[in-house]
């Protein structure tokens, strides 16, 4: 009659979280049972992120520590089933830990956007369009930004409006600009729950130009249109 | 970036064995498990079995306990899938798969062919 | 063995429509299901697991919902790549199985 190993109960574990969860809180278990009835003892390997704690009897998983869905989900850790006595032998199965994204990331610009410019004097008003992103995970759809000027003072001169759920056009309201560089403050929601809002600024100069882009004394870069 | 590669396409007669190879990159190769499928033509997907190459573990499906054998060498980074007494049946694309949650990463697959 | 029976076995649709494909486990499976995306002479890739989760790089027209024995994956607008044969496995325990497929081809 040989002694065998625990069984786990299932081929691997998983659990779904949100990410936000308190610390502490029960986030999953795993059970195993023993051919020869012997108690088992539940220990946890590879928690290298250090989120995790298992209650060796009942084989309950915890949280110890705030998670981190941008760290990488599902965060997966192996967890083994020894006999308590006997030949002690152990079986290792996995433990999977799903993190559901809650809003936390602020929108902000997609890329570096400075740079931007106007030839001056506009001979007609300008645009220019922008991207938006954030570092959440959309599930099932991509994210649905909305964007607004940043202050109010800004909206003689600028307007702003949507073209999708990542991008918008940036417009001039007249052609009375002076030549210098403007920072436009641009609002961005992710209507999110709970929303988030980021303020970026967009810097957009009024320059002359030679061939299309803005001349600058020696030393200085030409800069690339972009309207 | 994660790869796996199998060996190339075999033909084999009746009563033969055969052994597909897949050779992973690109991740730590004993963290996870690594399982082997098998589509026959105009059939759906069956599981064969997996192994940890950890602690070189092994879980056949029942179908196949007495004819598989799944090995891993860690120094190459490569597990093994040898199925013997081969019949006409066992004609079918060999797939390996990374476990995760499903399969993450597959091999291209390897076509096995028993013809006399 | 958990038997997984998925319906229908073809499909056929135009770009730009909804689609809607099933999975029955024959006993609960608590979630423990994968939907794969198989074209021909290539390897499957997995859309989903854990039922409604998308993976990394799969575009958010696919989704998945579910529980108990009942899976459901739609793809919310077609695209010309997403004709080809789909397939729910579960892995709740040994030995894992696969449904038979869904032909998704072109109207």
């Known amino acids: 009659d040989v002694n065998e190993a625990p069984q786990f109960s299932q081929h691997v574990f998983q659990a779904k979280v949100s990410e936000d969860v308190a610390i502490g809180t029960k986030v999953g278990n795993v059970t195993a049972k023993d051919p020869e009835g012997l108690d088992i003892s539940y220990s946890l390997r590879g928690d290298t992120r250090g989120w995790l704690k298992i209650d060796h009897v009942t084989g309950e998983i915890f949280s110890v520590a705030p998670l981190d869905r941008e760290a990488g989900s599902p965060y997966r850790v192996q967890v083994v089933a020894t006999e308590v006595g006997g030949s002690s032998l152990s079986s290792v199965s996995e433990f999977h830990l799903i993190l559901m994204d809650v809003n936390d990331n602020p929108p902000r610009l997609a890329k570096d956007y400075t740079g931007l410019f106007f030839c001056h004097p506009l001979s007609a008003p300008g645009s220019l369009i922008f991207e938006a992103t954030d570092d959440d995970q959309h599930l099932f759809r991509g994210p649905h930004f909305t964007f607004s000027l940043g202050s109010g003072s800004l909206q003689n001169d600028w307007e702003v409006s949507k073209i999708n759920g990542t991008h918008a056009r940036l417009s001039t309201r007249h052609t009375e600009f002076e030549e210098r560089e403007y920072v436009v403050l641009i609002r961005i929601n992710d209507g999110g729950r709970p929303p988030l809002e980021g303020i970026v600024s967009l810097p957009v100069t009024f320059c002359s130009c030679v061939e299309g882009s803005c001349f600058r004394p020696a030393g200085h870069k030409h800069h690339h249109h972009h309207h | 970036q994660v790869q796996l590669v199998q060996s190339g396409a075999e033909v084999k007669k009746p009563g033969a064995s055969v052994k597909v190879s897949c050779k992973a990159s690109?991740?730590?190769?004993?963290?996870?498990?690594m399982h082997w499928m098998r589509q026959a033509p105009g059939q759906g997907q069956e599981w064969m079995g997996y192994i940890n190459p950890s602690t070189d573990y092994t879980e056949y499906n029942q179908k196949f306990k007495d004819r598989v054998t799944m090995t891993a060498d860690k120094s190459t980074s490569t597990v093994y899938m040898e199925l013997s007494s081969l019949r006409s049946e066992d004609t079918a694309v060999y797939y390996c798969?990374?476990?995760?949650?499903?399969?993450?990463?597959w091999g291209q697959g390897t076509l096995v062919t028993v013809s006399s | 063995d958990i038997q997984m029976t998925q319906s229908p076995s073809s499909l056929s649709a135009s770009v730009g429509d909804r689609v809607t494909i099933t999975c029955r486990a024959s006993e609960n499976i608590d979630s423990y299901l994968a939907w794969y995306q198989h074209k021909e002479g290539k390897s499957p890739k997995l859309l989903l697991y854990?039922?409604?989760v998308l993976a990394d790089g799969v575009p958010s027209r696919f989704s998945g919902s579910g529980s108990g024995t009942d899976y459901t994956l739609t793809i919310s607008s077609l695209q010309p790549e997403d004709f080809a044969r789909y397939y729910c496995q579960h892995y709740y325990r040994t030995p894992l199985t696969f449904g038979q497929g869904t032909k998704l081809e072109i109207k």
């Open positions: 854990a039922a409604t």
């Open positions: 690109g991740y730590s190769f004993s963290s996870y498990w």
């Open positions: 798969a990374r476990s995760r949650l499903g399969f993450d990463y």
